[in-house]
Interface confidence: low
């Protein structure tokens, strides 16, 4: 019976390890600076890295500019968006700016597209200063279903900071849906 | 056999409890106001509390101003940095400020230091207002290896808000590395 | 003995599933726009949704404007607060604003109230621009005991953005207290 117990213990140790390591989904996506849209209008950002530097993804999918959920659950979502301008880049079209981010959820299966989180600020980036910078951070806890897509919209995309430590978004699963 | 089953169940209950409570590493470190550097240059902040008020640490180490990872894993890292100035503190050296935070990762094994996250804003803190305040929040999900160190750099350290609810950073482990 | 082993395995599978799904507490509360206080003074926000749109709560309680902890643990707390003003709403009482959020913890057992996190900015919302916007995000990892209450205080509540994607706060349990 001891051998049997050892076998039970062994199999459970495997299960416990597997369960613990069972790859809770996550993603940390960083801006792809080679393909940032121009202009000052509100756009959806579609070019992100998922596999270089700090960018990583597991049990989620990145496709067509969207982070796709593969596993139902409650996730913590976050985004950090940095805007900057140096006078050497030329004059701004306007000194009064609305620097915004919108984190949206879209489902093709069930018709819906909604903004989960937004943040930002109106700014007066005067010509009196040679450099301007501003960062936005948002985060929240949301129920996500398999097949749903997370995307990022920003205003003034041409002002985005292209560094991987500056402009990124991500998600990690915290718990199952009951 | 029933006693044996009870023993198996009992040992597994312990394991399950241990596994669940198995002290996922975390830290929440608050600024040590008695030792904030002066000046307006960019500096690494080395004085943080880890064991008073809201500050807590478990299965991580705080040493020489750095948060040291003891357990491989994917962690959520965050920082909240508040800057403030009151006219009673005297005039600012300049009214045009760059208030920034950089969350960096250093590895001793592979000598390197990288910025994981940055945030902040350029500000015009005019003499027309007696009080100025600004807060930055950043957060993200990163793979950390045992022995790696997390540190915080800021510009204008003399303007930091010394309250424990204002200037802090932290981390908590979310999942293992596969 | 095989049947006995199967029984042990079966019961443990149940326990493992229950343990995994065991409803770690969380809440995501969104502003109730029908009941936002007026004025520019600092107030506690008491009207939040917990059961519509993105707002959800599980194994925590919302009562009297406060988020009540039902289960001891270490929680990640966060808040996102957006302020806005359009000239069509009339002139601001003052163009120099202090836009702030305070996340506080109150304990009934040990009568006390403490600020866990604060964030915000002083702003100059000049009449030269027809629209102004500003968002604050704060987040941190805290030990919470059953019966403790989390609440949100803001300055200038009349300027709050009433959208569910703009003004919200929440919490999710990450781990037990050892």
């Amino acid at each position: 019976i001891r051998a049997e117990k050892a076998m039970v213990d062994g199999s459970w140790l495997d299960l416990a390890k597997r369960s613990k390591l069972e790859a809770q989904p996550f993603a940390h996506l960083t801006i792809n600076a080679t393909d940032i849209p121009s202009g000052s209008h509100k756009v959806s950002l579609s070019s992100w890295y998922h596999d270089r530097g700090w960018a990583k993804i597991s049990n989620m999918t990145f496709s067509n500019g969207k982070l796709i959920v593969n596993q139902d659950g409650f996730y913590y979502l976050y985004a950090n968006i940095c805007f900057r301008h140096h006078e050497t880049s030329g004059d701004l079209a306007t000194e009064y700016l609305q620097l915004m981010v919108y984190v949206t959820k879209t489902s093709i299966k069930i018709p819906s597209s909604h903004t989960l989180m937004k943040g930002g600020s109106t700014k007066y980036w005067s010509g009196n200063s040679e450099f301007h910078f501003y960062s936005i951070n948002v985060g929240g806890f949301f129920k996500l279903r398999s097949g749903e897509e997370i995307s990022i919209e920003v205003s003034n995309p041409s002002l985005l900071d292209p560094d991987q430590d500056a402009t990124y978004f991500g998600a990690f699963k915290v718990r199952d849906i009951d | 056999i029933r006693a044996e089953k009870a023993m198996v169940d009992g040992s597994w209950l312990d394991l399950a409890k241990r596994s669940k409570l198995e002290a996922q590493p975390f830290a929440h470190l608050t600024i040590n106001a008695t030792d904030i550097p002066s000046g307006s240059h960019k500096v690494s902040l080395s004085s943080w509390y880890h064991d008073r008020g809201w500050a807590k640490i478990s299965n991580m180490t705080f040493s020489n101003g750095k948060l040291i990872v003891n357990q491989d894993g994917f962690y959520y890292l965050y920082a909240n940095i508040c800057f403030r100035h009151h006219e009673t503190s005297g005039d600012l050296a300049t009214e045009y400020l760059q208030l920034m935070v950089y969350v960096t990762k250093t590895s001793i094994k592979i000598p390197s230091s990288h910025t994981l996250m940055k945030g902040g804003s350029t500000k015009y803190w005019s003499g027309n207002s007696e009080f100025h305040f600004y807060s930055i929040n950043v957060g993200g999900f990163f793979k950390l290896r045992s022995g790696e160190e997390i540190s915080i750099e800021v510009s204008n350290p003399s303007l930091l808000d010394p309250d424990q609810d204002a200037t802090y950073f932290g981390a908590f482990k979310v999942r293992d590395i596969d | 003995i095989r049947a006995e082993k199967a029984m042990v395995d079966g019961s443990w599978l149940d326990l493992a599933k229950r343990s995994k799904l065991e409803a770690q507490p969380f809440a995501h509360l969104t502003i109730n726009a029908t009941d936002i206080p007026s004025g520019s003074h600092k107030v506690s926000l008491s009207s939040w949704y917990h059961d519509r749109g993105w707002a959800k709560i599980s194994n925590m309680t919302f009562s009297n404007g406060k988020l009540i902890v039902n289960q001891d643990g270490f929680y990640y707390l966060y808040a996102n607060i957006c302020f806005r003003h359009h000239e069509t709403s009339g002139d601001l009482a003052t163009e120099y604003l202090q836009l702030m959020v305070y996340v506080t913890k109150t304990s009934i057992k040990i009568p006390s109230s403490h600020t866990l996190m604060k964030g915000g900015s002083t702003k100059y919302w000049s009449g030269n621009s027809e629209f102004h916007f500003y968002s604050i995000n704060v987040g941190g990892f805290f030990k919470l005991r059953s019966g403790e209450e989390i609440s949100i205080e803001v300055s200038n509540p009349s300027l709050l953005d009433p959208d569910q994607d703009a003004t919200y706060f929440g919490a999710f349990k990450v781990r037990d207290i050892d």
């Epitope: 069930i110 597209s113 909604h114 903004t115 | - | 519509r52």
Partner: antibody
Framework: EVQLLESGGGLVQPGGSLRLSCAAS????????MNWVRQAPGKGLEWVSS????????YYADSVKGRFTISRDNSKNTLYLQMNSLRAEDTAVYYC??????????WGQGTLVTVSS | QSVLTQPPSASGTPGQRVTISCTGS?????????VHWYQQLPGTAPKLLIY???WRPSGVPDRFSGSKSGTSASLAISGLRSEDEADYYC??????????FGGGTKLTVL
Amino acid sequence: EVQLLESGGGLVQPGGSLRLSCAASGFTFSNTWMNWVRQAPGKGLEWVSSISVNSNYIYYADSVKGRFTISRDNSKNTLYLQMNSLRAEDTAVYYCARDSEYAFQNWGQGTLVTVSS
Amino acid sequence: QSVLTQPPSASGTPGQRVTISCTGSSSNIGAGYDVHWYQQLPGTAPKLLIYDNEWRPSGVPDRFSGSKSGTSASLAISGLRSEDEADYYCATWDDSLHWVFGGGTKLTVL
């Protein structure tokens, strides 16, 4: 307070057309999916059509596909349903419903469409 | 013929507990889509009663509860009251890109 007010219903002959409107207030219309649901006299609820925030996703029930067109004007906070080639079986109370996540959170009071010769 | 099947009628006396079932298929409820319940009082528009299988909107008494398992869902009403007399509809999304409703259940409080 969320309000949805349908209008445009009435009596129409088979083969005729009608345009229903739904005026929305009390929420950010431009951020919300909208829907039409109908209920024939003495019968149950039947979904008719859904439209996304910026009109790039549109869905119809098989029973109305090719005959009905859903549209919206976010600047006017108004939802529309253009109904062509009407049949007797289209007789119903038509409700405008606001989508909140995946459920119909708010409903209008409805407008009656009668198709009869 | 509705895609989701509900009993046409149900009844109970005040104070009793009543359950209404809603049966779908692998292309809707069984595909993992959430089930929502609507209450329609006589002569009025429908009102959301339960969403996402089990969640109650503000103002809905906790006497109403919902659950889902496999290809079925159910609505339970405990402590039945006369004002609960109404038609009840379940609804969910279907892989055919359609919203689908149950045929409705007329609840009578005896």
